[in-house]
């Protein structure tokens, strides 16, 4: 049994880091493998993560963490029984993938303005809470070409757009994702999408 692709890990910078790797053949990850991880910190202990299958030869492990600070570094040991398959380290602050925003809501009752709001996925005491920016994706269910991205570079988790920038009488969907420039993070996953029917009063044309 050998590791084909070494574990790579990303942290949500809150409570979970996710490590993925590939073995050289089909593997029952949960029964054959264990990923031990230990914070490099005085008197810390090694903790065990039981991996799950992620495709035939792929494994994924969700490492529980109390909290994360920039100085944190973890040692990682991948074991198959008594055999050490791989040894490495992981610094969560250098591999951050934020949590996805939630509770995306489209408010359509504000005159001819669409107000999209969502929730910051972090509690106020987390460092990322005040450092997230967002991308909002809006697309038409009827027209695949009607697909747009709005970058929200301010901290408030909301976006206002004129309803008239979208076609009237058509159903649209929206989703939102987040990233943090301070840690040069990857983008989060997209939030679940939300759907609404776009309708607005056409301006009266005078001839």
């Amino acid at each position: 049994m050998k590791v084909l692709q070494e574990p790579t890990c990303v942290s949500d910078y809150m409570s979970i880091s996710t490590c993925e790797w590939k073995m050289n053949g089909p593997t029952n990850c949960s029964t054959e493998l264990r990923l031990l991880y230990q914070l490099v910190f005085l008197l810390s202990e090694a903790h065990t993560c039981i991996p799950e299958n992620n495709g035939g030869a792929g494994c994924v492990c969700h490492l529980l963490m109390d909290d994360v600070v920039s100085a944190d570094n973890y040692t990682l040991d991948l074991w198959a029984g008594q055999q050490l398959l791989w040894k490495g380290s992981f610094k969560p602050s250098e591999h951050v993938k934020p949590r996805a925003p939630g509770n995306l809501t489209v408010h359509t009752n504000v005159s001819d303005t669409l107000l999209l709001t969502w929730s910051n996925p972090y509690p106020p005491d987390n460092y990322l809470y005040n450092h997230l920016t967002y991308a909002v994706n809006i697309w038409s269910e009827n027209d695949p070409a009607d697909f747009r991205i709005y970058n929200v570079t301010y901290l408030e988790p909301s976006l206002r757009i004129a309803a008239s920038t979208l076609k009237s009488g058509i159903s649209y969907r929206a989703r939102v994702r987040a990233w943090a420039q301070c840690y040069n993070t990857t983008w989060s996953e997209w939030s679940p999408s939300t759907k609404w029917h776009n309708s607005y009063r056409e301006p009266f044309e005078q001839h």
Epitope: S44, H47, D66, D67
Partner: antibody
Framework: EVQLVESGGGLEQPGGSLRLSCAGS????????MTWVRQAPGKGLEWVSS????????YYADSVKGRFTISRDNSKNTLYLQMNSLRAEDTAVYYC??????????????????WGQGTTVTVSS | DIVMTQSPLSLPVTPGEPASISCRSS???????????LDWYLQKSGQSPQLLIY???NRASGVPDRFSGSGSGTDFTLKISRVEAEDVGFYYC?????????FGQGTKLEIK
Amino acid sequence: EVQLVESGGGLEQPGGSLRLSCAGSGFTFSDYAMTWVRQAPGKGLEWVSSISGSGGNTYYADSVKGRFTISRDNSKNTLYLQMNSLRAEDTAVYYCARDRLTITIRPRYYGLDVWGQGTTVTVSS
Amino acid sequence: DIVMTQSPLSLPVTPGEPASISCRSSQSLLYSTGYNYLDWYLQKSGQSPQLLIYLASNRASGVPDRFSGSGSGTDFTLKISRVEAEDVGFYYCMQALSTPYTFGQGTKLEIK
């Protein structure tokens, strides 16, 4: 009641050996790191050694490294300090103390919050 | 090793008066979690040390509120707002950021 009780001290000749014990009660012993601190007659406090909750990590003062061994038996709620090659300068009262909570990913520190009554080690010919 | 320096080494105090002990470390005791790994202990004559303050400013369980700890980085202070006769003994600061844990020399508080 949370309590630590040391035993095993006594008079020993230079080069000799002693094994100190520290019995814990009133708390989940294996959840906590443990520490030995000593105090020579008329002197201040000196850290000797520490061990994590599982016993997997141990730390020693340079003055005792290679001569003393810290260990624990969590099934007996007992901490040990095996002292070999004893020297006159090891003469002291030895205290065990409860250290940080180590069952969490990041050990939680609340100070050395519980101390034993101390056991006296005298090294003399 | 981190060197801990206490002052004064002797502190005569009148009962009811305040008292203050300083402790300086040769390196910062502030970890990136925001905690300072600095404790204060009191050892009364013939007794084991007892924890007063942990993580620089947190009072241990059962410790009277006349004891308070402050400071960050390398400079720390233990204050007793109104000294009582039972407070006599040796006061030690200790860093627990890294091994070897190191103690200050101790401050002897006595009643005038």
